[in-house]
């Protein structure tokens, strides 16, 4: 057979015996001559021994490029392939010679008393046990032990070939310690040499370092690195480590196999590197290599060694965080330090604890940020070893998209008397304050009850074309006042007012406020009526437990059948762009109320009295009147707000102060509550009375003491009282300096 590609076209060497297989008996002479076209060499079985004296290769007497191989008295072990080839090429002619020796049917290996067969447990892999035969057609079986098992050729995966040996799936003999071939000749058994079975694997699945990353230590500490190699079964592993100071005197390496669950197709090996008393020179890359011989895998990790424990903030630590209400806010504590610091968060000096709304850890997370979360957050890092502390302040600013308070609006369902001047108000709360508030309008009939539009309770006005109030043609004459700023319920709000100079046309008005984080809008139904008129007696919002009367006045010659109703609860507009229901077109939710009728010369007056008003009495009250001629019903609505009773509180502290004789003292005491409290001042627990030197202004809110004297020194108390109780604040005024003796000013304070 030809192997390789020669540079010149050559014929194969020609053998004197023109056969592929030659069978001869033991003790006879084997002689084969080979002729060719260039220098020839012979190869024969076992010619690697070098001590083979029986084989003779001679030049032919009758020509160039010819060699004869002679073996006198052949033995069974001479069985095998005899090859004649051209030097330095793969061109060769081969003859396979069987030396039949029935006393030794298996060819013995040259030097071994036993052989080794290496196998893997791979189900698909076969192994060849090289028990070659000196006879081609022997009946050979394979014996494996222990326990003893015999395998016989099955014409499929188990077979014996005299030139090759016994082939068998490797997993069948993986349990065995040794195997040998056995031949039966004339009821006589002949055995080959023993072959030791060595099961080998080589594949390494992975090499894992633990800890795998972020290893930090300070000088003097102990480093322990574990390197685990996961392999297939029957694998042996060599470990090696590479690290900055490989000559380390405190280094300790321990390698061991780890137990794996039985039935596992995996084996684990562990190598542990320990360095006691680590130094700065040990900082660097640590690499573990695991090797089975056929496969090497490596993994690395960086070990950082610090001179001493420390803590510091990272450069990326923020100082200002901006968020919008409802968002999730994450403020990470970015630090450098070893060991990792303890992290504590504070808000305005108060420690923060984690709960369902806030998580205070490496990252401060506020699940749904609200306005009250605005403030200064301090993060304090503490090194657990050195106790060194570092602090950093983060200001959180929470933006609020414009919110237009319902109670700040004229009722969404109020009715307005024809021809009157009216003021519509939008009170906007937003952070930052709105950069603009715009007003728009639309005729009521353009919006409501158009048959082409599906009108729902939640969106009864399918308004599309809002017009700017600058364009009031066909509507009411309008003037937009300049925005005002007011402190309402402790919040800075922007108040935009729209003045309707004469209520002539029913319309819808919309105010829209926009700031950097969003927009808000409110729609006001401005229903103009020529019908009855509602007034409140007394003409102010009542407080709980006060009495109030709602008067409905109608021209007796025009209207009859005056009736009071209360409007039942309606779904409030909840989405931007939703509009209030025009109440007079929807009388299904009215509750009839008891009322008393009075009359004067021109009008009927229906009075509905609320004694001891409660918060439940709040709502929309409807007065219905019927036109005497047309019988058409007219309704007017008035929103009643009942103020909650609130005990007095005093905002702002009265501060202790020191003043020099002859100077003035000015202090203020702002009280709130409902009903509004009365303010009184005391000096050293005695009522303070106004005189030429003591001035009380703004309902006693502001106290001025002019040209103070030594006797003005003392404890001053501001007390705010109502039926719900009192609140008080105190301050001590110290007067410094010598008293001037003068008759120019007789300054008697009555205490």
């Amino acid at each position: 057979a030809s192997v390789g590609l020669p540079s010149v076209s050559l014929d194969l060497p020609r053998l004197s015996i023109q056969k592929d297989i030659l069978t001869i008996k033991a003790n006879t002479t084997l002689q084969i001559t080979c002729r060719g076209q260039r220098d020839l060499d012979w190869l024969w079985p076992n010619n690697q021994s070098g001590s083979e004296q029986r084989v003779e290769v001679t030049e032919c007497s009758d020509g160039l490029f010819c060699k004869t191989l002679t073996i006198p008295k052949v033995i069974g072990n001479d069985t095998g392939a005899y090859k004649c080839f051209y030097r330095e090429t793969d061109l060769a002619s081969v003859i396979y010679v069987y030396v039949q020796d029935y006393r030794s049917p298996f060819i013995a290996s040259v030097s071994d008393q036993h052989g080794v067969v290496y196998i893997t447990e791979n189900k698909n892999k076969t192994v060849v046990i090289p028990c070659l035969g000196s006879i081609s057609n022997l009946n050979v079986s394979l014996c494996a032990r222990y326990p003893e098992k015999r395998f016989v050729p099955d014409g499929n995966r188990i077979s014996w070939d005299s030139k090759k040996g016994f082939t068998i799936p490797s997993y069948m003999i993986s349990y065995a310690g040794m195997v040998f071939c056995e031949a039966k000749i004339n009821d006589e058994s002949y055995q080959s040499i023993m072959y030791i079975v060595v099961v080998v694997g080589y594949r390494i699945y992975d090499v894992v370092l633990s800890p795998s990353h972020g290893i930090e230590l300070s000088v003097g500490e102990k480093l322990v690195l574990n390197c685990t190699a996961r392999t297939e079964l029957n694998v042996g592993i060599d470990f090696n480590w590479e690290y900055p100071s490989s000559k380390h005197q405190h280094k300790k390496l321990v390698n061991r196999d780890l137990k794996t669950q039985s039935g596992s197709e995996m084996k684990k090996f562990l190598s542990t590197l320990t360095i006691d008393g680590i130094t700065r020179s040990d900082q660097g890359l640590y690499t573990c290599a695991a090797s089975s011989g056929l496969m090497t895998k490596k993994n690395s990790t960086f070990v950082r060694v610090h001179e001493k424990p420390f803590v510091a903030f990272g450069s990326g630590m923020e100082s200002l965080v901006e968020a919008t209400v409802g968002e999730r806010v994450r403020i990470p504590a970015k630090y450098l330090g070893y060991p990792p610091p303890e992290i504590k968060w504070y808000k305005n000096g108060i420690p923060l604890e984690s709960n369902h709304t806030i998580k205070a850890g490496h990252v401060l997370t506020i699940m749904e940020v609200s306005e009250r979360d605005t403030g200064n957050y301090t993060v304090i890092l503490t090194n657990p070893i050195s106790k060194e502390k570092q602090s950093h302040v983060v200001s959180l600013v929470v933006y609020v998209p414009p919110q237009i308070g319902e109670k700040s609006l004229i009722s969404p369902v109020d009715s307005y008397q024809y021809g009157t001047t009216q003021t519509l108000t939008c009170t906007v709360y937003a952070i930052p304050p709105p950069h603009h508030i715009h007003w728009y309008w639309q005729l009521e009939e353009e919006c409501a009850n158009e048959p082409s539009h599906a009108v729902s309770v939640t969106n009864p006005y399918p308004c599309e074309e809002w017009r700017s109030v600058e364009d009031f043609q066909g509507g009411n004459k309008i003037e937009v006042n300049k925005n005002q700023f007011a402190l309402i319920e402790g919040k800075n709000k922007t108040v935009s007012t729209l003045v309707i100079q004469a209520a002539n046309v029913s319309a819808l008005y919309k105010c829209e406020a926009v700031n950097k984080v969003g927009r808000g809008e409110r729609v006001i139904s401005f229903h103009v009526t020529r019908g009855p008129e509602i007034t409140l007696q007394p003409d102010m919002q009542p407080t709980e437990q006060e009495s109030v009367s709602l008067w409905c006045t109608a021209d007796r010659s025009t209207f009859e059948n005056l009736t009071w109703y209360k409007l039942g609860p309606q779904p409030l507009p909840i989405h931007v762009g939703e509009l209030p229901t025009p109440v007079c077109k929807n009388l299904d939710t009215l509750w009839k109320l008891n009322a008393t009728m009075f009359s004067n010369s021109t009008n009927d007056i229906l009075i509905m009295e609320l004694k001891n008003a409660s918060l439940q009495d709040q709502g929309d009250y409807v007065c219905l009147a019927q036109d005497r001629k047309t019988k058409k019903r007219h309704c007017v609505v008035r929103q009643l707000t009942v103020l909650e009773r609130v005990a007095p509180t005093i905002t702002g502290n009265l501060e202790n102060q020191t003043t020099s004789i002859g100077e003035s003292i000015e202090v203020s005491c702002t009280a709130s509550g409902n009903p509004p409290p009365q303010i009184m001042w005391f000096k050293d627990n005695e009522t303070l009375v106004e005189d030429s030197g003591i001035v009380l202004k703004d309902g006693n809110r502001n106290l001025t003491i002019r040209r103070v004297r030594k006797e003005d020194e003392g404890l001053y108390t501001c007390q705010a009282c109502s039926v719900l109780g009192c609140a008080k604040v105190e301050a001590f005024f110290i007067i410094e300096g010598a008293q001037e003796k003068t008759n120019l000013e007789h300054h008697h304070h009555h205490h």
Partner: antibody, heavy 117, light 112 residues
């Protein structure tokens, strides 16, 4: 720069012995498995032997098993192949190769062995 | 042992054109870890082999993206798009799924 330099090749008679060396530089020798691969005159590549990083585990092709021995000296950054009972079919260029993940990522320039009488 | 058959034995090309070299294995090289253990090497004239592709399709470091490997469990292809003069040499594939690791017989790429 990774370098592998083989030496020790030459002409040997059948049955003779020879030892090949491979000097490694430019990388941490003791962290890589090493192998010998040969290329026959017909240009076929044949894996010959491999050794683990510490030298504890060795593997051989069936054709050289029992005749060749692979070894390494990590202190000298050198890989060896001791070849005994040489045959004509061992004639080839012998390369040493660095192994990682089973892959031969760097090869030497090769040394030639000729087995001939 | 796993037998690797490479085709063609010789491949004459014109610079700039794309070529494919095939490699077939007598057994699937897809291992149970989901990886296909087939490598490609290039041996330039007078040089030692160099690793081009490992795990069937991953380029070794420094190998241009003109070289790409693909295939299934037993049939594999090395594609060279826009052949350059420096690409001449013998290309070998090698299996690593089963010991002993075996090589293909080689494909000689030469410029026409």
């Amino acid at each position: 720069e990774v370098q592998l330099v083989e030496s020790g090749g030459g002409l040997v008679k059948p049955g003779g012995s020879l030892k090949l060396s491979c000097a490694a530089s430019g990388f941490t020798f003791s962290m890589y498995g090493m192998s010998w691969v040969r290329q026959t005159p017909g240009k076929r590549l044949e894996w010959v032997a491999s050794i683990s990083i510490g030298g504890s585990y060795t593997y051989y092709a069936d054709s050289v098993k029992g005749r060749f021995t692979i070894s390494r000296d990590n202190a000298k950054n050198t890989l060896y192949l001791q070849m005994n009972s040489l045959k004509a079919e061992d004639t080839a260029v012998y390369y040493c190769a660095r192994e990682l993940d089973g892959n031969y990522d760097y090869w030497g320039q090769g040394t030639t062995l000729t087995v001939s009488s | 042992d796993i037998v690797i058959t490479q085709t063609p034995l010789s491949l004459p090309v014109t610079p700039g054109e794309s070529v494919s070299i095939s490699c077939r294995s007598s057994k699937s090289l897809l291992y149970k870890d989901g990886k296909t253990y087939l490598n490609w090497f290039l041996q330039r004239p007078g040089q030692s082999p160099q690793l081009l592709i490992y795990l069937m399709s991953t380029r070794a470091s420094g190998v241009p993206d003109r070289f790409s490997g693909s295939g299934s469990g037993t049939d594999f292809t090395l594609k060279i798009s826009r052949v350059e003069a420096e690409d001449v040499g013998v290309y070998y594939c090698q299996q690593l799924v089963e010991y002993p690791f075996t090589f293909g017989s080689g494909t000689k790429l030469e410029i026409k």
